[in-house]
């Protein structure tokens, strides 16, 4: 897939890995919150 224009920003290159890790962490936290919510609703 075509890279977005922001990929030309040096920041994208220097922080690519940490941004991906931060996003993965954010998604994991969101999934955890969703599971907790489902548990509460399930009860």
């Amino acid at each position: 897939s075509e890279e977005p224009p922001i990929s030309l920003d040096l920041t994208f290159h220097l922080l690519r890995e940490v941004l991906e890790m931060a996003r993965a962490e954010q998604l994991a936290q969101q999934a955890h919150s969703n599971r907790k919510l489902m548990e509460i609703i399930g009860k």
Partner: antibody, heavy 118, light 112 residues
Framework: EVQLQQSGPELVKPGASVKMSCKAS????????MKWMKQSHGKSLEWIGV????????FYNQNFKGKATLTVDKSSSTAYMQLNSLTSEDSAVYYC???????????WGQGTLVTVSA | DVLMTQTPLSLPVSLGDQASISCRSS???????????LEWYLQRPGQSPKLLIY???NRFSGVPDRFSGSGSGTDFTLKISRVGAEDLGVYYC?????????FGGGTKLEVK
């Protein structure tokens, strides 16, 4: 011409929060990350964090995690930084900055002075 | 964190003189891609910082050629060949090779 126009000075009480803005013009807002800096009076510069205007993804310097929250409004090409639980240590000038393909902080706003005082 | 140490803290010069500012990093700032993301900024009194040099030795657009950057690894230098009144202010070195990105403490260039 690239311009980053920051909001005016803020005088806030300890424990309160403040939200400052940085309006970008002269380029496509979503083509570049926005970064924020802190400069305490007479001191050096500290990098706070960065935000991707496309999706709101953020990455913070650990020293500012929980202190600063970065957001954007794409419709108005404006970046925001909120600082919470303010103390005298947070009194400083805060800058928004933008890079290029070759350098990290090529363009700077004029700064927003935050004074925390009872 | 990478500590950036600048010397001297203050540099008194006569206009027209050459000035030299040193910046040392606490570890190598060569990035895994082979580049060294060392930048120099000038903050004039009452103004926002301005980019002078990126990747050790490249002048940003509009920066006069009297400014030159050099160095490698952990040791870097900014030279101003003929200091003008508009060059007075505080100079900062900065590294973007390792997160968190960090600045030096600054060197104040002032008239003798």
């Amino acid at each position: 011409e690239v311009q980053l126009q920051q909001s005016g000075p803020e005088l806030v009480k300890p424990g309160a929060s403040v939200k400052m803005s940085c309006k970008a013009s002269g380029y496509t807002f979503t083509d570049y990350f926005m970064k924020w800096m802190k400069q305490s009076h007479g001191k050096s510069l500290e990098w706070i964090g960065v935000i991707n205007p496309n999706n709101g993804d953020t990455f913070y310097n650990q020293n500012f995690k929980g202190k600063a929250t970065l957001t954007v409004d794409k419709s108005s090409s404006t970046a925001y930084m909120q600082l919470n639980s303010l103390t005298s240590e947070d009194s400083a000038v805060y800058y928004c900055t933008r890079g290029t393909a070759r350098a990290l902080f090529a363009y700077w706003g004029q700064g927003t002075l935050v004074t925390v005082s009872a | 964190d990478v500590l950036m140490t600048q010397t001297p803290l203050s540099l008194p010069v006569s206009l027209g003189d050459q000035a030299s500012i040193s910046c040392r990093s606490s570890q190598s700032i060569v990035h895994s891609d082979g580049n060294t993301y060392l930048e120099w900024y000038l903050q004039r009194p009452g103004q926002s910082p301005k980019l002078l040099i990126y990747k050790v030795s490249n002048r940003f657009s509009g920066v006069p050629d009297r400014f030159s950057g050099s160095g490698s690894g952990t040791d870097f230098t900014l030279k101003i060949s003929r200091v003008g009144a508009e060059d007075l202010g505080v100079y900062y070195c900065f590294q973007g090779s390792h997160v968190p990105w960090t600045f030096g403490g600054g060197t104040k260039l002032e008239v003798k």
